[in-house]
């Protein structure tokens, strides 16, 4: 039997059973999540669940830019430092940069300071690039 690798939507990239879309549009966190959902296929702002996944994403984004933070699907909806992935994935892998927590910052971004391998929290209303993910 020939097993075909699933195809992703045009402009999205494939890695280990998932499709990822990097958007250089400027959206606050909730608008970014709505836009991800609008692409269908069960897409959400991306969950990042391993160092391997983080490294692949970081390498891809670095091909486009190295200075702008990017929204991912991690947020603190109750504002109690109880972080969760918007797609329902288990919050096990963590990659926070040193001084990232606290204050009124309840949405997570991939930080450009460490080549997108670490996360920082930020104010959810800020307009930034974003990363979507779905399983084809």
């Amino acid at each position: 039997d020939i097993i075909m690798r699933p195809s992703c939507a045009p402009g999205w990239f494939y890695h280990k059973s998932n499709c990822y879309g990097y958007f250089r549009k400027l959206r606050n966190w909730s608008d970014a999540e709505l836009e991800c959902q609008s692409y269908g296929n069960g897409a959400h702002l991306a969950s990042i669940l391993s160092l391997k996944e983080a490294s692949t994403i970081a390498e891809y984004i670095s091909g486009y830019q190295r200075s702008q933070p990017i929204w991912i699907g991690l947020h603190d909806p109750q504002k109690r430092q109880q972080w969760q992935w918007i797609d329902g994935a288990m919050y096990l892998y963590r990659s926070w940069s040193g001084k990232s927590m606290g204050g009124n910052k309840h949405c997570a971004e991939m930080s450009s300071n460490n080549n997108f391998l670490t996360w920082s929290s930020n104010e959810c209303n800020k307009r930034q690039h974003f990363l979507c993910k779905y399983r084809p």
Partner: antibody, heavy 116, light 107 residues
Framework: EIQLQQSGPELVKPGASVKVSCKAS????????MYWVKQSHGQSLEWIGR????????TYNQKFKGKPTLTVDRSSSTAFMHLNSLTSEDSAVYYC?????????WGQGTTLTVSS | DIKMTQSPSSMYASLGERVSITCKAS??????LSWFQQKPGKSPKTLIY???GLVDGVPSRFSGSGSGQDYSLTISSLEYEDMGIYYC?????????FGGGTKLEIK
């Protein structure tokens, strides 16, 4: 009340540099991005760049090619724009503006005149 | 960069008249557009955000509409205090870009 108070007018010689300040009050300074805009005499508005006061991350309009440097001082809730190697083309009114979810609030403007 | 083409560049209108100003983007900007009013010697003031959201405190005679590439600002019944220069701004992508402005004067 949300306010952005900019520094006063500047008269500088060609080749010099200048630092314009924008002091924010009435809101949490790190919670909103700040952008800067140039308005040459009788002309439209040009977006120079943006800074996130929370982490210092900047974005510049490539048209201005290294002319501006945006910084913040969180302790005084102040944003700065440094302009270098000034020429007569840099003579303009410069505005800072707080980027809101719904509406943007602007400073009163700083007039820069570059003349020998 | 996204180019914002604003028209007309200047216009005269009578008090009580309905006035419309348009902005056309060089690509779809997903309604991420604001309208500003600037009076002589003053800084711009936001009137409309997200193409059709009226800023608190702005008179209801101002309204915004549009989607995709085409947007407009309408003043339903012109008042004397409405004269000034109006600008659109797209904030869908970096760098943000402004329209060239529309100078509105009273006939």
């Amino acid at each position: 009340e949300i306010q952005l108070q900019q520094s006063g007018p500047e008269l500088v010689k060609p080749g010099a540099s200048v630092k314009v300040s924008c002091k924010a009050s009435g809101y949490a300074f790190t919670s909103y991005n700040m952008y800067w805009v140039k308005q040459s005499h009788g002309q439209s508005l040009e977006w120079i760049g943006r800074i996130d006061p929370h982490n210092g991350v900047t974005t510049y309009n490539q048209k201005f090619k290294g002319k501006p440097t945006l910084t913040v001082d969180r302790s005084s809730s102040t944003a700065f724009m440094h302009l270098n190697s000034l020429t007569s083309e840099d003579s303009a009114v410069y505005y800072c503006a707080r980027e809101g979810y719904d509406y943007d609030v602007w400073g009163q403007g700083t007039t820069l005149t570059v003349s020998s | 960069d996204i180019k914002m083409t604003q028209s007309p560049s200047s216009m005269y209108a009578s008090l009580g008249e309905r006035v419309s100003i348009t902005c056309k983007a060089s690509q779809d900007i997903n309604s991420f557009l604001s309208w500003f009013q600037q009076k002589p010697g003053k800084s711009p003031k936001t009137l409309i955000y997200r193409a059709n959201g009226l800023v608190d405190g702005v008179p209801s005679r101002f309204s915004g509409s549009g989607s995709g590439q085409d947007y407009s600002l309408t003043i339903s019944s012109l008042e004397y205090e409405d004269m000034g220069i109006y600008y659109c701004l797209q904030y869908d992508e970096f760098p943000y870009t402004f329209g060239g402005g529309t100078k509105l004067e009273i006939k």
